[in-house]
């Protein structure tokens, strides 16, 4: 069965920085989406070889692509706090095939220590494949930010 390998699982970046998300498949797909999970999932980009990429207005001018639809690296630039969230690659074959998700934590410079990625993949990756008729894994399971440690208040 077709799979989507997605990396990284999680990345913490300061405001204004860039992040790379790579979506790799074994081929045989028609195109690939990057979608942001949440209570109201957003479609970020659609990429298909030989076709001008389609980009959400919010990210226009902030996204670059390298590679091909089978092995695509998406670079998001000038990240804002509101870009924090879980991003999932979705490959179009005869059915929708999902990547494991990338948790992007965009932080203020001084709060870098509060929210750091663990080695574990985002919780969205533990979900079974969504049933037919379901657009995305349940967004409620893919929380954007972990709770800060209890002693995270500034002195």
């Amino acid at each position: 069965a077709q799979e989507v390998q997605q990396s990284p699982h999680c990345t913490t970046v300061p405001v204004g920085a860039s992040v790379n998300i790579t979506c790799s498949t074994s081929g045989g797909l028609r195109g690939i989406y990057l979608r942001q999970l949440g209570p109201q999932p957003q479609d970020i980009i659609y990429y298909e070889d030989g076709v001008v990429p389609t980009t959400d207005r919010r990210f226009r001018g902030r996204i670059d692509f390298s590679g091909s639809q089978d092995n695509l690296t998406i670079t998001m630039h000038r990240l804002q706090l509101s870009d924090t969230g879980t991003y999932t690659c979705q490959a179009i074959t005869e059915v929708n095939v999902y990547g494991s998700g990338t948790l992007v934590l965009v932080t203020e410079e001084q709060s870098q220590g509060w929210h750091r990625c663990s080695d574990a993949p985002p919780r969205a990756s533990a979900l079974p494949a969504p049933p037919t008729g379901s657009a995305l894994p349940d967004p409620q399971t893919a929380s954007a930010l972990p709770d800060p440690p209890a002693a995270s208040a500034l002195p």
């Epitope: 076709v51 980009t55 179009i92 074959t93 059915v95 008729g133 379901s134 657009a135």
Partner: nanobody, 124 residues
Framework: QVQLQESGGGLVQAGGSLRLSCAAS????????MKWFRQAPGKGREFVAG????????SYSDSVKGRFTISRDNAKNTVYLQMNSLKPEDTAVYYC?????????????????WGKGTQVTVSS
């Protein structure tokens, strides 16, 4: 199973506007990429516009770009096609289509469900 019903077609003069609607039955409307196609008399079916699940991605054929706008209201299970500056060559039957595993390009790949169409006639 999804059923699609187009409305809003009619006769309009060149330069005029129309707004087509496509109402979908079923609770999983937001699980579908939606597209509009058209077929002029004696011609093949042609892609017009497409919109992604959330509505944040849209695509258009070169022939309608800047004149037509596709949008959707997931709460109302409806997709729209606002057509401005209509030309006689826009005369066709307009169909909406829905697909769960569909691209944003100008093909009908993955479009599982189709409406019966609504006639748009643009007179000069």
């Amino acid at each position: 199973q999804v059923q699609l019903q187009e409305s809003g077609g009619g006769l309009v003069q060149a330069g005029g506007s129309l707004r087509l609607s496509c109402a979908a039955s079923g609770r999983t409307f937001s699980s579908y990429v939606m597209k509009w196609f058209r077929q002029a008399p004696g011609k093949g079916r042609e892609f017009v516009a497409g919109i992604s699940w959330s509505g944040s991605l849209t695509s258009y054929s070169d022939s309608v770009k800047g004149r037509f706008t596709i949008s959707r209201d997931n709460a109302k299970n409806t997709v729209y096609l606002q057509m401005n500056s209509l030309k006689p060559e826009d005369t066709a039957v307009y169909y909406c289509a829905a697909g769960e595993a569909a691209t944003m390009s100008d093909t009908d790949y993955g479009m599982d469900y189709w409406g019966k169409g609504t006639q748009v006639t643009v007179s000069s």
